[in-house]
């Protein structure tokens, strides 16, 4: 009995035309939503003039439907048992699942000012930037609509910069009509224990963003894992959103619509400083902001973002060191709302429910030459927004899953 089931499972999780896995893999049958909460800055003038703590108030959710597009350029390679593809990006605003509209205004850090002052550290060039910031009537903070902030706007300051720079700025710009990849993953035909594991990303086995083992592309994309998942396993996966591979560990048994699943969570150890978790030494890329690699809970991904000082964390700086959140007022981290989890059906390795949570922050530093930054007395890692990307297997699919998989085993 068990051997027959194993044989059937092994056959059905292979990523090739005709299997259950392939059909759901090419185009997810699950509705995936990305909710955004924007951190609206309440005291922009006090921060700019007196280097006060930044008072933020989260506003959201603003919800988009994502991951509704089928994978593109799906190409099997029989020689090395891989399948390559592009994952197209698309986002559709869902007004009924949102607290407002895409035209809602927010006071946020001026992305261009923060980024340019970080990228161009030459003092003379910073004086030129100062002139252009002033000429364009830009400041340390700006008011932007949700649509602008997420998907892009023409920045008035960057439009004056006399170098060939992209003048459109947005946290997720460009997004619609773009694609992530090329991914090349093992299809599992020759070895089912490798199914969905990434062989290469953008043609490489390494990212070129980090030193040593931190630069490796490990595991799957978290949508599925090789079958017969054990509770003792550490599940590795790669997330292009955070420009790194990360891992999840078993937390608890969960019943999802009558299907027994394993809840795997990203542990606090994954975000720890090298002092606590020596494996993380290569995610510490500089000594000043990280206070000699003792700060934790924020990841500098500037190398992955053309030098822009983007820091990724968990929402509300969950699992981050006190020095990171100290200059920000209005944050309330809690595990239940702000951690990332994956609910995995252990026989197939399919992720049937997930909540991916992350926060996008931008570093802003004092600058003697830039007037709107010269009164700052400290560095700030400024939260801009946090997101919750969720997906849950639909009732119909769950019934089918119960009858075809778990029902047969129990």
């Amino acid at each position: 009995g068990d051997l027959l089931i194993q044989k059937t499972i092994k056959k059905q999780v292979v990523l090739e035309e005709g299997t259950i896995a392939f059909k759901n893999w090419v185009k997810t049958g699950t509705e995936v939503y990305r909710q955004f909460w924007i951190f609206d800055v309440q005291n922009p003038q006090e921060v700019m003039m007196n280097s006060s703590n930044i008072q933020v108030k989260q506003r959201g959710p603003y919800t988009y439907r994502v991951r509704f597009l089928a994978k593109e350029n799906v190409t099997q390679d029989a020689e090395d048992n891989t399948v390559s593809f592009l994952q197209p990006n698309g986002a559709i605003f869902e007004p009924s699942l949102s607290v407002g509209t895409e035209a809602d205004n927010f006071t946020v850090l001026n992305l261009a000012v923060a980024a340019a002052s970080h990228i161009y550290q030459n003092q003379f060039v910073q004086m030129i930037l100062n002139s252009l910031i002033n000429k364009s009537k830009s400041s340390m903070f700006q008011v932007r609509t949700l649509r602008e902030l997420l998907w892009g706007y023409r920045d008035p300051f960057l439009s004056l910069v006399p170098y060939p720079v992209t003048t459109t700025v947005g946290l997720f710009y460009p997004y619609n009509n773009t694609a992530d990849g090329v991914y090349k993953v093992f299809n599992g035909k020759d070895n089912i224990s490798k199914v969905a594991i990434i062989d290469t990303y953008k043609g490489k086995r390494n990212l070129s963003y980090w030193e040593s083992h931190c630069d490796m592309i490990n595991g799957t994309d978290a949508a599925s894992f090789p079958p017969f998942v054990e509770k003792s396993q550490v599940l590795q996966f790669f997330s292009s959103d955070i420009c790194r591979s990360i891992y999840a560990v078993f937390e608890s048994d969960v019943n999802l619509k009558g299907i027994p699943v394993y809840r795997f969570v990203l542990p606090s150890k994954a975000f720890a400083s090298p002092v606590e978790n020596p494996d993380n030494y290569c995610f510490c890329t500089e000594k000043i902001i990280s206070k000699n690699c003792t700060s934790y809970g924020v990841l500098d991904i500037s190398k992955c973002k053309e030098g822009r000082p983007v820091y990724i964390s968990l929402p509300h700086f969950l699992y981050a060191s006190p020095d990171v959140s100290e200059p920000i007022d209005g944050l309330n981290p809690n595990e239940e709302e702000h951690r990332t989890y994956l609910d995995i059906e252990p026989i197939t390795g399919f992720t049937l429910q997930f909540a991916k949570r992350l926060q996008v922050n931008l570093l802003v530093k004092p600058s003697e030459k830039i007037q709107v930054l010269k009164n700052l007395k400290r560095n700030y890692i400024v939260p801009i927004l946090w997101l919750n990307e969720t997906g849950t297997i639909g009732d119909e699919k769950a019934n089918m899953f119960r009858s075809q998989v778990t029902g047969k085993i129990n």
Epitope: V125, M127, I128, K135, E368, K369, K374
Partner: antibody, heavy 116, light 107 residues
Framework: EVQLQQSGAELVKPGASVKLSCKAS????????MHWVKQRPGQGLEWIGE????????NYNQKFKGKATLTVDKSSSTAYMQLSSLTSEDSAVYYC?????????WGQGTTLTVSS | DIVLTQSQKFMSTSVGDRVSVTCKAS??????VAWYQQKPGQSPKALIY???YRYSGVPDRFTGSGSGTDFTLTISNVQPEDLAEYFC?????????FGGGTKLEIK
């Protein structure tokens, strides 16, 4: 259009002090750092220092510390440079230039002659 | 301080010719170099920034090149109005420094 009107030529005695002015117009005076440059006859250019007119914060070339003092008067959009303990070595043309896309606008210069 | 050396104090050229003015830095300055033109009795005028970018309104016969320690200002199709002294300037580190200048004479 950026315009910089510098004060007229000065003839002063050694040991004295002098205050040169640079009146700016055509732009928001406090928005751009102001630089001062020295040019001795038949010689190259020497950077003296810079001042942020918004808060009068100044930085100097070490060589001119104690010699030059940069100030501004925001109300009249005027930058000043005071030169003290003058010697013949200070005889030169002095230029002011605000930073926009660089040092891309220079005043017409003030000729200072130090002679007894 | 970074020293900028313009080895040729004078250069002679004819209308229509191509001429190259050189500037050598005593240490690496990246591309943080500007070029200025100063006509007799006038203030310096900015021509080039970031070693190779022309300021708006500067004729395209003026071209800047180089990075690190060696920089060149090339004037192709020299015109009579190009009679002037040319200075390089580095802004890689403080104090800002200028080259000694190269006087262009038209034959």
């Amino acid at each position: 259009e950026v315009q910089l009107q510098q004060s007229g030529a000065e003839l002063v005695k050694p040991g004295a002090s002098v205050k040169l002015s640079c009146k700016a117009s055509g732009y928001t005076f406090t928005s751009y750092w102001m630089h001062w440059v020295k040019q001795r006859p038949g010689q190259g250019l020497e950077w003296i220092g810079e001042i942020d007119p918004s808060d009068s914060h100044a930085n100097y070339n070490q060589k001119f510390k104690g010699k030059a003092t940069l100030t501004v008067d925001k109300s009249s959009s005027t930058a000043y440079m005071q030169l003290s303990s003058l010697t013949s070595e200070d005889s030169a043309v002095y230029y002011c230039a605000p930073i926009y896309y660089g040092l891309d606008n220079w005043g017409q210069g003030t000729t200072l002659t130090v002679s007894s | 301080d970074i020293v900028l050396t313009q080895s040729q104090k004078f250069m002679s050229t004819s209308v229509g010719d191509r001429v190259s003015v050189t500037c050598k830095a005593s240490q690496n300055v990246g591309t943080n170099v500007a070029w200025y033109q100063q006509k007799p009795g006038q203030s310096p005028k900015a021509l080039i920034y970031s070693a190779s970018y022309r300021y708006s309104g500067v004729p395209d016969r003026f071209t800047g090149s180089g990075s690190g320690t060696d920089f060149t200002l090339t004037i192709s199709n020299v015109q009579p109005e190009d009679l002037a002294e040319y200075f390089c300037q580095q802004y890689n580190s403080y104090p800002l420094t200028f080259g000694g200048g190269t006087k262009l004479e038209i034959k």
